[in-house]
Each structure stands twice: as structure tokens, then as C-alpha cells.
């Protein structure tokens, strides 16, 4: 069973998590981003159910094509460059889901925008903290 | 159709700059990125870096970090990659490619007949 | 970075032969969301810029004769020429387009045998 330190600390790195991925959809969400528009033309798969830690597989599978979309608007919209970022989130991510169990993610048919993905993805951690809290 | 054609060779002598200039055709430079990549004689394929003329924004290969300035006219849909501190080793054909969609690294459809940049004392 | 790694390093067919090379990647190219091999294979003849002939490991690209096939996922891949003609004499060389930098193999010379 999960002891409160546990708890705790998964707490944290979801908040963390979650700060990450917001801060991103923040900066491409900047009403000064002229890359938007090319940006949401990219398509990025989203996982059929995310309910579970271990359903952040689904998030690490897409991190890669997340950073060089990414990259096309790194210096005006992000503090950090996007492969630092990226390998922030992969750390925690990692972390988080933990490597016992080999998980085959399953995503769903349609496809989304980077700003669909990361709102997903922002949800997610939203309700998982709100279940530990 | 998509052209891009590139300036003539160089002869550079070690420790100075060239400037290679890559005029894009048959479409609008500012819809997708423009790629560098560079052969030395006999050699493989080696990636430098792209810029999105759109808006200068740029992307280099680690390697070339700090020696290689890529910019971008739009007004002349010219494109341009400088590298200097230049030293034998960097004696190649550098090419400017053009990737087949938008996706940042998508593969290079479009390619210049490439300039031959040789560095000798 | 990705190291892509080819063989052989060159290869000597006799005309109306397949040819077949191999390129291994140091990470998988599959993007399990769309399932796609994100791999492509260039030609390249003396004096020439590259051309590419395949992407997404076996998508041929626009105008490229269909005796070019590319196959693989993961980490493994080849590309077959499957009756050599004399103007397929060339360099050939695989490239990862899933991450930067976008890394290519060293080449593998195909001749006439």
C-alpha cells in the first residue's frame, strides 16, 4: 500500500508535471506566437484512456515529436530550450509511471493539436492530484 | 516547380568566413524550413541546422553552435548559411535542402545543386 | 543522437539483380501513436545533390521507380533495389527524420558486378 510520503511525493512530481506541460501550453497559446497556426497543423495521438499512472506511456511516446514542434518557436515563447524541457518531462514522467510493468499504450483513432494534447495531458494530472489529495 | 539554386564555389583561406547563398523557386519560402547540410570529399551527410524564414527562427546542430550564423530574405527568397573560424576539415559541398512537408524534420525532397567550399592556406 | 549505421559498405550486383542494404538505428523510429518508421533512404550519383526515394521506411516518394522498396520498423531496416539497372549505380543512404539532428548513415556504394 502507498504510505503518505509516497503519496506525497507522486503529489509533487504530478505538480510539477503539470506546471511543465501548462507552462508550454502558455507559451504557445502567447497571443505573440506567430507559429500557431503551423503548430496546430501538426498531428500528435492521443492514448484511448488515461486514468492510471501508468497511462503516462502514452505521454513519453509522444514527447519526441512534442520537442521538435516545439523547437519552432523556441527562443521567442519558452524559457528553457525545448530539449530541456522535453527531458524534464521525460525524468518525471518516467519517474512517475515507473518501470515494473511494461504498459502497450492504446490510442485513440482521431488524432489532435498540440493544444488538445496538452490540455489531455493537463487534465489528467489535474485528476490524479485531485484523487491523492 | 520547387528550385533551389545556390551560390558558386569558394576558396576560403583558415580562419576566415564564406557566406553560401540558396535562392528558393517554384514556391514560397516562407512556407516551409530551409535546411544545411554538408559533405566533405568522399564523406557522408552531415546535418547543420535549419532556419524558418518565416521568422528567422533557428535550429543548429550542436556541433556548428557559435560557428555557423544561418539567416533568411524573404524580399529575395534568398536563404544563407555563414560559417566561419573556417579550417580544413570544413573544405565540403555545402547543400541547402527543403523538407518534403512541414514537419520540423521531415525528409529533404528539395535539394541545391550544392557549393563546393574549400579551405587552404 | 541517433547513430545510423549501414551495411554493407559497398555492394557489387550483376545488372537485372536485386540488391538489398541494411541500416540499423541506435533508438527506435517508430512513433507508436500513427505507427510509422520515421526512416528515409537517399540516392546519391557523383557530382549530384542527394535524392530522396523513400520515407516513413516505405512510402516511395513521387516519381521513383517501383523497383526501389524500402521495408523495416523499430530499429532495422532495408532498402531493396529489386532489378539493378545501370543508372542505379550510386550512393545510397539511410536517414532518421524522428529527432534532432537528423542523422544519416555513412553510405553504402552500389556497383555493377
Known amino acids: 500500500a502507498p504510505t503518505s510520503s509516497s503519496t506525497k511525493k507522486t503529489q509533487l512530481q504530478l505538480e510539477h508535471l503539470l506546471l511543465d506541460l501548462q507552462m508550454i501550453l502558455n507559451g504557445i497559446n502567447n497571443y505573440k506566437n506567430p507559429k500557431l497556426t503551423r503548430m496546430l497543423t501538426f498531428k500528435f495521438y492521443m492514448p484511448k484512456k488515461a486514468t492510471e499512472l501508468k497511462h503516462l506511456q502514452c505521454l513519453e511516446e509522444e514527447l519526441k515529436p512534442l520537442e521538435e514542434v516545439l523547437n519552432l518557436a523556441q527562443s521567442k515563447n519558452f524559457h528553457l530550450r525545448p530539449r530541456d524541457l522535453i527531458s524534464n518531462i521525460n525524468v518525471i514522467v518516467l519517474e512517475l509511471k515507473g518501470s515494473e510493468t511494461t504498459f502497450m499504450c492504446e490510442y485513440a483513432d482521431e488524432t489532435a493539436t498540440i493544444v488538445e494534447f496538452l490540455n489531455r495531458w493537463i487534465t489528467f494530472c489535474q485528476s490524479i492530484i485531485s484523487t491523492l489529495t | 516547380q520547387v528550385q533551389l539554386v545556390q551560390s558558386g564555389a569558394e576558396v576560403k583561406k583558415p580562419g576566415s568566413s564564406v557566406k553560401v547563398s540558396c535562392k528558393a523557386s517554384?514556391?514560397?519560402?516562407?512556407?516551409?524550413?530551409i535546411h544545411w547540410v554538408r559533405q566533405a570529399p568522399g564523406q557522408g551527410l552531415e546535418w547543420m541546422g535549419w532556419?524558418?524564414?518565416?521568422?528567422?527562427?533557428?535550429n543548429y546542430a550542436q556541433k556548428f553552435q557559435g560557428r555557423v550564423t544561418l539567416t533568411a530574405d524573404t524580399s529575395t527568397s534568398t536563404a544563407y548559411m555563414e560559417l566561419s573560424s573556417l579550417r580544413s576539415e570544413d573544405t565540403a559541398v555545402y547543400y541547402c535542402a527543403r523538407s518534403l512537408d512541414s514537419y520540423p524534420i521531415d525528409p529533404f525532397a528539395y535539394w541545391g545543386q550544392g557549393t563546393l567550399v574549400t579551405v587552404s592556406s | 543522437d541517433i547513430v545510423m549505421t549501414q551495411s554493407p559498405d559497398s555492394l557489387a550486383v550483376s545488372l537485372g539483380e536485386r540488391a538489398t542494404i541494411n541500416c540499423k538505428s541506435s533508438?527506435?523510429?517508430?512513433?507508436?501513436?500513427?505507427?510509422?518508421?520515421?526512416l528515409a533512404w537517399y540516392q546519391q550519383k557523383p557530382g549530384q545533390p542527394p535524392k530522396l526515394l523513400i520515407y516513413y521506411a516505405s512510402t516511395g516518394q513521387s516519381g521513383v521507380p517501383d523497383r526501389f522498396s524500402g521495408s523495416g520498423s523499430g530499429t532495422d531496416f532495408t532498402l531493396t533495389i529489386s532489378s539493378l539497372q545501370a543508372e542505379d549505380v550510386a550512393v545510397y543512404y539511410c536517414q532518421q527524420h524522428y529527432v534532432t539532428p537528423p542523422t544519416f548513415g555513412a553510405g553504402t556504394k552500389v556497383e555493377i558486378k
Open positions: 517554384g514556391y514560397s519560402i516562407t512556407d516551409s524550413l
Open positions: 533508438q527506435s523510429l517508430l512513433r507508436n501513436g500513427n505507427q510509422q518508421n520515421y
Open positions: 532556419i524558418d524564414p518565416e521568422d528567422g527562427e533557428i
